[in-house]
């Protein structure tokens, strides 16, 4: 009779984490009598996975009924596969011996690789806001995937970025891997509504990549532009001066009016106008009683935006351009009207 052969038909199999793996093994003869054992690995360090005769192997079940007299199928199913189960599995026939069974023949082995999905990419930006024309770095991380091969791309508003560096760790063998990428993005004034996207493609995702996003609104600071203008006279001897604060982001803004360098009023931006690009506009105005001044007045609109150093714009109010009424009171008095409606927003 032909000598028994141990046949493992699958050279390799690939299983998704959490699923079951079926490792096939058949023998070609019932002789010699003796048990089958399954090992992961070969040589003296091999690890027993299943012993037909003894032991407790809670994750392993046999595909066939091994108690049947003529059974020659010794395939096993391992449940709830994790990346740590990867390796080469050998089906080994032993022949009866005393006191121990004696190894008779081994199958050629089945390489089990485990596919594990990457975690959802997490994108994080810089801790502090930056202004347009500056380059900022974003990082993207995803963990727990196997096999090691993975593709990562960066996009800004649908346009692929090229300035990034990616590392997959560890460099050597591991049951699972992590990816870390850093992309450099140049900010523009129009980026309040922009998004940075990290896209990860892996064999386990069946062509449907995972994405992580970061909104540039959390990264960008667009400093305001200021314009101080003198409006036509509202009433006799009163001049309306406005400070237009334009195109700023985020909203946090405090405005101070100074008259010849002295603080007149401070207000916090409230009712803002939003521009299409996501930036904001705000306007504050003052009524100046020119008759209270003998000399020209230097009015300064000073703006502190998002905790940054103040920026300011000044306007010289020519008192001589507004002749005083005959017989009017020229004694010093309040130069700036300070009634509630006089400082406003629009």
């Amino acid at each position: 009779e032909e000598e028994l052969q141990v046949i493992q038909p699958d050279k390799s199999i690939s299983v998704a984490a959490g699923e079951s793996a079926t490792l096939h093994c058949t023998v070609t003869s019932l002789i010699p009598v003796g048990p089958i054992q399954w090992f992961r690995g070969a040589g003296p360090g091999r690890e027993l996975i299943y012993n037909q005769k003894e032991g407790h192997f809670p994750r392993v079940t046999t595909v066939s009924d091994l108690t049947k007299r003529n059974n020659m199928d010794f395939s096993i199913r391992i449940s709830n596969i994790t990346p740590a189960d990867a390796g080469t599995y050998y089906c080994v026939k032993f022949r009866k011996g005393s006191p121990d069974h004696v190894e008779f023949k081994s199958g050629a082995g089945t390489e089990l690789s485990v596919r594990a999905k990457p975690s959802a990419p997490v994108v994080s930006g810089p801790a502090a806001r930056a202004t347009p024309q500056h380059t900022v770095s974003f990082t993207c991380e995803s963990h727990g995937f196997s096999p090691r091969d993975i593709t990562l791309k960066w996009f800004k508003n649908g346009n692929e970025l090229s300035d990034f560096q990616t590392n997959v760790d560890p460099a050597g063998d591991s049951v699972s891997y992590s990816i870390h990428s850093t992309a450099k993005v140049v900010l523009t004034r129009e980026d309040v509504h922009s998004q940075v996207i990290c896209e990860v493609a892996h064999v386990t995702l069946q062509g449907d990549p995972l994405r992580g996003t970061a909104n540039l609104s959390e990264t960008i600071r667009v400093p305001p532009t200021l314009e101080v203008t003198q409006q036509p006279v509202r009433a006799e001897n009163q001049v309306n001066v406005t400070c237009q604060v334009r195109k700023f982001y985020p909203q946090r803004l405090q405005l101070t009016w100074l008259e010849n360098g002295n603080v007149s009023r401070t207000e916090t931006a409230s009712t803002l106008t939003e521009n299409k690009d996501g930036t904001y506009n705000w306007m504050s105005w003052l009524l100046v009683n020119v008759s209270a001044h003998r000399d020209d007045v230097k009015l300064t609109c000073q703006v502190e935006h998002d905790g940054q150093p103040a920026v300011s714009k000044s306007h010289d109010l020519k008192v001589s351009a507004h002749p005083k009424e005959q017989g009017s009171n020229t004694a010093p008095g309040p130069a700036l009207a300070s009634a509630a409606p006089l400082g406003g927003s629009g």
Partner: antibody
Framework: QVQLQESGPGLVRPSETLSLTCTVS????????WSWIRQPPGKGLEWIGF???????FYNPSLKSRVTISLDTSKNQFSLKMTSVTAADTAVYYC????????????????WGQGTTVTVSS | DIVMTQSPLSLPVTPGEPASISCKSS???????????LDWYLQRPGQSPQLLIY???NRASGVPDRFSGSGSGTDFTLKISRVEAEDVGVFYC?????????FGGGTKVEIK
């Protein structure tokens, strides 16, 4: 193809600890045994021990009390530590890859490092 | 431990001629699965050892077919059908059946 590179100090003082690292490049740690073998000047080869990719270690009984082999799969490296060295430990130390795919035995030490000379002297 | 004994200690050879080295083990290297776990290595001067034969008779990848291994149980032989100048060096047998792995003392092959 797979290459092995030993690294570590070339001179060790008597009674101190010899530490060597072998870096595996161009291949996987998985499914192999990773061995240390030494060769005293003008003499034959002596097996020190090996570690399987699953972490199981095997040592030469004559050296076992002084030897530890460890594996860092994340760096594709394995290491040898030998304590309480004497002049008799002066040798060329080789790291090597051992194949296994047929039962309990081993199927050839098929890749060797170029060897690093370690001298034990005060 | 399994003791490995090689002979001869030194082997002067003529290029183009055959050569033979013997290796004996203190216990059988034939495992119950039918494999004989014996390797042959060549260490050329100033180089690391190189695997020639494993499992007694299987030639390693890239090894010229002038090298062949035979034997089973405790007696093994390495044959070189036609020695070439590049074959000079020390040949070692090693048992790979059980730990500790043990080497023979080596056979130095040199050109006459």
């Amino acid at each position: 193809q797979v290459q092995l590179q030993e690294s570590g100090p070339g001179l060790v003082r008597p009674s101190e600890t010899l530490s060597l690292t072998c870096t595996v490049s161009g291949g996987s740690i998985r499914n192999y045994y990773w061995s240390w073998i030494r060769q005293p000047p003008g003499k034959g080869l002596e097996w020190i021990g090996f570690i399987y990719y699953n972490g199981r270690t095997f040592y030469n009984p004559s050296l076992k009390s002084r030897v530890t082999i460890s594996l860092d799969t994340s760096k594709n490296q394995f290491s040898l530590k030998m304590t309480s060295v004497t002049a008799a430990d002066t040798a060329v130390y080789y790291c090597a890859r051992v194949r296994a795919y047929s039962g309990i035995g081993l199927d050839g030490t098929d890749v060797w490092g170029q060897g690093t000379t370690v001298t034990v002297s005060s | 431990d399994i003791v490995m004994t090689q002979s001869p200690l030194s082997l002067p050879v003529t290029p183009g001629e055959p050569a033979s080295i013997s290796c004996k083990s203190s216990q059988s290297l034939l495992y119950s699965n039918g494999y004989a776990y014996l390797d042959w290595y060549l260490q050329r001067p100033g180089q690391s050892p190189q695997l020639l034969i494993y499992q007694g008779s299987n030639r390693a990848s890239g090894v010229p077919d002038r090298f062949s291994g035979s034997g089973s149980g405790t007696d093994f032989t390495l044959k070189i059908s036609r020695v070439e100048a590049e074959d000079v060096g020390v040949f070692y047998c090693m048992q790979a059946l059980q730990t500790p792995l043990t080497f023979g003392g080596g056979t130095k092959v040199e050109i006459k």
